[in-house]
């Protein structure tokens, strides 16, 4: 076990040009506060995954008001160290994130408004009991100077904090099979403290609160003897002295999650829900307070001053969860219609349009044809995101700009002859037929089948097609 | 780091089928939080989007490409693919393969280096 | 489709100049728009994002302004590494749309 600290110098504008606007003002007086979430290993784990090492919250730094018209400073902090517990030993690679957040004090409904200025991370290799390091990261315009180290919690000792020591009992030498405790000579090396309750005469430990079983016992505690009088079950390795199956400790078996959480199998281990007031890998960290930042994800807690009354985690958008730890998939519902796409963009969701839609859902189909005009008397026709032009007879193209051929499509019935013309077309029936494209057949007694041909217009002439 | 590759014939006939594939390296093609885009150049001009996919599959398309693209991928391999079919010369262009971010806000962060695939006889 | 235009389309200035590139929509895109830097031979790099995000490792001196329809992107003292051709993008709806793009060079 140990604590690592950090300790925030400063947090201003970075150098170079374009030197970010304070973030406070006459008329929003603000002040800072930082957050700390440690990871362990070096993997680039996913901003929202949880602080499995860790995480605190500071106190919040002094009021500050930007003098009108001077540039930012460096920002006035609040007091002492962030401290971040760890009850196992130290990894010695781990990842860190550390948001500067803003307070602001103005008149605001409801409380008051946290905004998040200035997000930091990194990959780090730390040996526990090393001095101080000293960092710089920088965040668009804002830079952060601070320091960091991992120490032990006495009786632990050693790099990773996994080496317990004590006093000597006696004075010359230490008990047996036990080594002094370089740098600690007066000290010894402590016998391994196996996890609480593991069974003495069944269970054993090669790391600081583990419990491992010695064969024929099972159970987080190694508790319970195995059965070998069934061999049903297809877990665990095969007996010796049976020759079946001996069903060993599936990780849910004994329920090792403390404190009332409830154990589910993951493909790896196993992973624990923990009521409220509880966190760690087995719910075995209780009396957590806001002092413990137990609010993930950028989530703010309130309440909890001490380890009796409960905090409460207000979660950013698209986080829920006791903690803020489950991220909130928002475009699951599909709230955007007509195939567009829903973007999730913290503060709000928003649809973008697949072409000929648009409205916040994606639920207008646009019109088309609107400010799109087809020329010489064409008409708009709409469909599927696109516009296309119904030309007037003897134009075409898209938008009916280009002269058409209007006898292409050969429109005289009957063998009638075709013959362009500046306002469209005229046909020149053959004998016997008439009408504007030589449709209609002239009666033998000279009547036609339909209306009779306008004055001065005798059958067999051409017939004008306006 | 992150990384894209393309791969695939710099030289295509016309009306054949133009095939790349993008590479990712670096990071999962199945994350929740991207789309994976072409992007083309041609010679001396300006960048056109041609689509984008999703590791699910989802698929948008540039409408002025649309009847002639086809982009697919395979988490299996962590590649996605695009494939234009009946290419003339004016699809002669660098083609690039993009990481378009979806939460939070919106944009293409992280690019190949780009292939020129030339359409000639 | 969202027609995108720029100005000027190319521009000589010097060190540290102070450089302006606007961008326009045909239709307000709200701030969902992005300026991106290509340099010849290379991909495009992106500088800002959201009109006016910087794209974490990009230099302060370049920023972005703008919504609905105008935008621009200044470079507040230009240096030897900016000159390249610089193309906003609206991400507002299908199809996504690039600006023809401006090329800086020196003077």
């Known amino acids: 076990a140990g604590v690592f600290e950090l300790q925030i110098h400063s947090f201003g504008p970075g150098p170079g040009p374009g030197a970010p606007r304070s973030p406070c003002s006459a008329r929003l007086p603000c002040r800072l506060f930082f957050r700390v979430c440690l990871k362990p290993g070096l993997s680039e784990e996913a901003a929202e995954s949880p602080c499995a090492l860790g995480a605190a919250l500071s106190a919040r730094g002094p009021v500050y008001t930007e003098q009108p018209g001077a540039p930012a400073p460096d920002l006035p902090l609040p007091d002492g160290l962030l401290q971040v517990p760890f009850r196992d030993a130290w990894p010695g690679t781990f990842s860190f994130i550390i948001e500067t957040w803003r307070e602001e004090l103005g008149d605001q409904i409801g409380g008051p408004a946290w905004s998040l200025l200035a997000r930091v991370a990194g990959r780090r290799r730390l040996a526990a009991g090393g001095p101080w390091a000293r960092d710089i990261q920088r965040a668009g315009a804002w830079e952060l100077r601070f320091s960091y180290r991992a120490r032990c919690e006495p009786p632990a000792v050693g790099t990773a904090c996994t080496r317990l020591c004590r006093p000597r009992s006696a004075p010359s030498r230490c008990g047996p099979g036990l080594r002094p405790c370089a740098p600690l000579e007066d000290e010894c090396e402590a016998p391994l403290v196996c996890r609480a309750g593991c069974s003495p005469e069944h269970g054993f430990c090669e790391q600081p609160g583990e419990c491992r079983c010695l064969e024929g016992w099972t159970g987080p505690l190694c508790t319970v003897p195995v059965s070998t009088s069934s061999c049903l079950s297809p877990r665990g390795p095969s007996s010796a002295t049976t020759g079946c199956l001996v069903p060993g400790p599936g990780p849910c078996d004994g329920n090792p999650c403390a404190n009332g959480g409830s154990c589910s199998e993951t493909p790896r281990s196993f992973e624990c829900t923990c009521p409220r007031g509880f966190y760690g890998l087995r719910c075995e960290v209780s009396g957590v307070t806001c002092a413990d930042g137990p609010c993930f994800n950028g989530g703010l807690c309130v309440g909890g001053a001490d380890p009796d009354s409960a905090y409460i985690c207000h979660c950013p958008p698209g986080f829920q969860g006791s903690n803020c730890e489950k991220r909130v998939d928002r475009c699951s519902l599909q709230p955007c219609r007509n195939g567009g796409l829903c973007l999730d963009l913290g503060h709000a969701l928003r649809c973008r349009c697949r072409a000929g839609f648009a409205g916040p859902r994606c639920e207008h189909d646009l019109d088309d044809c609107a400010g799109r005009a087809c020329a010489n008397g064409g008409t708009c026709v709409e469909g599927g995101g696109a516009h296309r032009c119904s030309c007037a007879l003897g134009f075409g193209g898209r938008d009916c700009r280009e002269r058409a051929d209007p006898c292409a499509a050969r429109p005289c019935a009957h063998g009638g002859r075709c013959y362009a013309h500046f306002s469209g077309l005229v046909c020149a029936c053959a004998p016997g037929y008439m009408g504007a494209r030589c449709e209609f057949p002239v009666h033998p007694d000279g009547a036609s089948a339909l209306p009779a041909a306008p004055p001065g217009l005798r059958p067999g002439d051409p017939q004008r097609y306006l | 780091q992150l990384q894209l590759q393309e791969s695939g014939p710099g030289l295509v006939k016309p009306s054949e089928t133009l095939s790349l594939t993008c590479t990712v390296s670096?990071?999962?093609?199945?994350?929740?939080?991207?789309?994976w885009g072409w992007i083309r150049q041609p010679p001396g001009k300006g960048l056109e989007w041609i689509g984008s996919i999703y590791y699910s599959g989802n698929i948008y398309h540039n409408p002025s490409l649309k009847s002639r693209v086809s982009i697919s991928v395979d988490t299996s391999k962590n590649q996605f693919s695009l494939r234009l079919s009946s290419v003339t010369a004016a699809d002669t262009a660098v083609y690039y393969c993009?990481?378009?971010?979806?939460?939070?806000?919106?944009?293409?962060?992280?690019w190949g280096q780009g292939t020129l695939v030339t359409v000639s006889s | 489709a969202i027609q995108m235009t720029q100005s000027p389309s190319s521009l000589s200035a010097s060190v540290g100049d102070r450089v302006t590139i606007t961008c326009r929509a045909s239709?307000?895109?709200?701030?969902?728009l992005g300026w991106y830097q290509q340099k010849p031979g290379k991909a495009p790099e992106l500088l800002i994002y959201?009109?006016?995000s910087l794209q974490s490792g990009v230099p302060s001196r370049f920023s972005g302004s703008g919504s609905g329809t105008d935008f621009t992107l200044t470079i507040s003292s230009l240096q030897p590494e900016d000159f390249a051709t610089y193309y906003c993008l609206q991400d507002y709806n299908y199809p996504l749309t690039f600006g023809p793009g401006t090329k800086v060079d020196i003077k």
């Open positions: 993009a990481r378009e971010i979806i939460v939070g806000a919106t944009h293409f962060d992280y």
């Open positions: 959201a009109a006016s």
């Open positions: 670096g990071g999962s093609i199945s994350s929740s939080s991207y789309y």
């Open positions: 239709q307000g895109i709200r701030n969902d």
